[in-house]
């Protein structure tokens, strides 16, 4: 199967968690942190124009 | 701003369903990115699925991909979790979220109080 996208980190991402429990075998969850589902699920909403409305916040 | 109430809850066997409800009070909900978070007991709180304001872009962690769906109503100011396939593993506190912009970063910054599932084996 192929890797799903927020699967893996990205370095400009900054903190971030491996969805894949796997991938993190040392354990480094933090409060602080975010899974790379959520980050990649907010950095997409952020960059598409149907994700979030303008003026939002 | 948005306030978040979580609904639908409860015990039920491994591989049944469960249906997450999350009602928004305000008029601004549709201008909101919508989550559904999870944690279970001893564990740190877990991304499940997401949700673009207008319900068409959806998101979803390895673990639930195929078996949990989020959708939204806008005109009811409601955000679904439709849970099939249910496994012990599943058993959290289940949260909805709303997600703001500040300065260019999204984050999830509006939590509901959270509704218990529990997956029993």
């Known amino acids: 199967l192929p890797t799903l996208p927020w699967s893996v980190c990205q370095e400009e991402w900054g903190d971030c968690l491996p969805s894949d429990p796997d991938l993190d075998p040392v354990g480094t969850i933090t409060n602080e942190t975010k899974s790379s589902a959520e980050l990649y699920f907010l950095k997409t909403v952020l960059q598409q124009k149907d994700g979030i409305e303008d003026g939002l916040g | 701003q948005v306030q978040l109430q979580e609904s639908g809850g409860g015990l039920v066997q491994a591989g049944g369903s469960l249906r997450l409800s999350c009602a928004a009070s305000g008029r601004t909900f549709s201008r909101y990115a919508m989550g559904w978070f999870r944690q279970a007991l001893g564990k740190e709180r877990e991304f499940v699925a997401g949700?673009?304001?207008?319900?068409?872009?959806?998101y979803y962690a390895d673990s639930v991909k195929g078996r949990f769906t989020i959708s939204r109503d806008n005109a009811k100011n409601m955000l679904y979790l439709q849970m099939n396939s249910l496994k012990s593993e599943d058993t959290a506190v289940y949260y909805c979220?709303?997600?703001?912009?500040?300065?260019?970063?999204?984050?999830?910054?509006?939590w509901g109080q959270g509704t218990q599932v529990t997956v029993s084996s």
């Open positions: 979220a709303g997600v703001t912009v500040v300065g260019g970063a999204p984050a999830f910054d509006y």
């Open positions: 949700i673009n304001w207008s319900g068409s872009m959806t």
